[in-house]
């Protein structure tokens, strides 16, 4: 038999953040290797990660072709050292993944505060727009490009001297908030897709950034502007 000592994969799990999408499974192979196939509900199967001893397969390139489609993957188990034989008609053991719809299910990555700028009693806080691997006309799209107004950001801000938090929301990447003159504030943002009703509707909070911390440094994510 061509599938002697091979066992079907199990615990097939999608891990996806900002559309970077990896299928994981068990077990680590002993006498076998794996090949993954992926398709949409109406499409043909496409093979990826041929005869791999890994227990993961990056399927980003396939799912970004249409992030609103629903995908199904399956993992085939072949004997280790397998060379595809032309005469074998026996189907190797395989296991199906759960269905996966990237637009609805990809996790939102941790956002980053790009800059904040104070003018008088107003502070403009800008959230960095994350790039994804989704393309349109050979151009990579940002998270905002993909989700549009489905994506909002929540800003949490508080005086450095107290713990009482206030919140603001925006469906752009910028906030303009009122602050007390002479007070330093701290900020953290969270990405949210309000239309989702599942655990993945919110990202983790961004790192906290505070006014009055004169780092004087330029970061990859942009400059902090402190105008006092």
């Amino acid at each position: 038999s061509g599938t002697t000592n091979t066992v079907a994969a199990y615990n097939l799990t999608w891990k996806s953040t900002n559309f970077k999408t990896i299928l994981e499974w068990e077990p680590k192979p002993i006498n076998q290797v794996y090949t993954v196939q992926i398709s949409t509900k109406s499409g043909d199967w496409k093979s990826k990660c041929f005869y791999t001893a890994d227990t993961e397969c990056d399927l980003t390139d396939e799912i970004v072709k249409d992030v609103k489609q629903t995908y199904l993957a399956r993992v085939f188990s072949y004997p280790a050292g397998h060379v595809e034989s032309t005469g074998s008609t026996e189907e190797p053991p395989y296991e199906n993944s759960p269905e996966f719809t990237p637009y609805l299910e990809t996790n939102l990555g941790q956002p980053t505060i790009q800059s904040f700028e104070q003018v008088g009693t107003k502070v403009n806080v800008t959230v960095q727009d994350e790039w994804t691997l989704v393309r349109r006309n050979d151009t990579f799209l940002s998270l905002r490009d993909v989700f549009g107004k489905d994506l909002i950001y929540t800003l949490y801000y508080w005086k450095s001297s107290s713990s009482g938090k206030k919140t603001a929301k925006t469906n752009t990447n910028e906030f303009l908030i009122d602050v007390d003159k002479g007070e330093n504030y701290c900020f953290s943002v969270q990405a949210v897709i309000p239309s989702r009703r599942t655990a993945n509707r919110k990202s983790t909070d961004s790192p906290v950034e505070c006014m009055g911390h004169e780092k004087g440094e330029s970061r990859e994510t942009g400059h902090h502007h402190h105008h006092h």
Partner: antibody, heavy 124, light 108 residues
């Protein structure tokens, strides 16, 4: 010869987040799994979790809600974060390479390269 | 979770004697996933045996491993002074990966 060099804060207060990093010298992250293991004082070894070069993770269910293991292939290093620590998290923390070895039609797995260990103490 | 039970907890022997360490699994473990490690005070564990019976690079041939299924054994044919240490078995097949509680081989 592959070597693992690890570092991170050694003294934490309860509720803080433990953060350790392990750098891989003399070899690649690719093709291996990278584990964190800990050993409380005078006790045995406990596996925390592992990560593949592309970022796939496996965690010990007893710690899963508090653990994040990440990888930075550009720096050839991987990291451990353990949130909301208590005195029970006091231990020596080791990073290790989990090697899949192919021989005569099958794979074998073992941890063949270890860091020297970082002592982490949680105390108020 | 696969529980690995090592026995005895402590083995008191003299240099030159034979040491037999046992590792029993709560459910069957493929030998491909079973390894043995040696640990000395203040040091990281060191791989001795993988695949239940294959010696790691640089390990002297006085160390040997055997067994399958749920019962595995590490044997040190003639104890050298540097062999007095704690020995752990480990399985890396089923999450969570687990270690045995260890056997301490001490000088009698």
């Amino acid at each position: 010869q592959v070597q693992l060099q690890q570092w991170g804060a050694g003294l934490l207060k309860p509720s803080e987040t433990l953060s350790l990093t392990c750098a891989v010298y003399g070899g690649s992250l690719s093709g291996y799994y990278w584990s964190w293991i800990r050993q409380p004082p005078g006790k045995g070894l406990e596996w925390i979790g592992e990560i593949g070069a592309s970022g796939s993770t496996r965690y010990n269910p007893s710690l899963k809600s508090r653990v994040t293991i990440s990888v930075d292939t550009s720096k050839n290093q991987f990291s451990l974060k353990l949130s909301s620590v208590t005195a029970a998290d006091t231990a020596v923390y080791y990073c290790a390479r989990d090697t899949p070895y192919y021989y005569e039609g099958g794979y074998y797995y073992y941890m063949d390269v270890w860091g020297k260990g970082t002592t982490v103490t949680v105390s108020s | 979770e696969i529980v690995l039970t090592q026995s005895p907890g402590t083995l008191s022997l003299s240099p030159g004697e034979r040491a037999t360490l046992s590792c029993r699994a709560s459910q069957s473990v493929s030998s491909s996933y079973l390894a043995w490690y040696q640990q000395k005070p203040g040091q990281a564990p060191r791989l001795l045996i993988y695949g239940a019976s294959s010696r790691a690079t640089g390990i002297p041939d006085r160390f040997s491993g055997s067994g399958s299924g749920t019962d595995f054994t590490l044997t040190i044919s003639r104890l050298e002074p540097e062999d007095f240490a704690v020995y752990y078995c480990q399985q890396v097949g089923v999450v969570p990966y687990t270690f045995g509680g260890g056997t301490k081989v001490e000088i009698k």
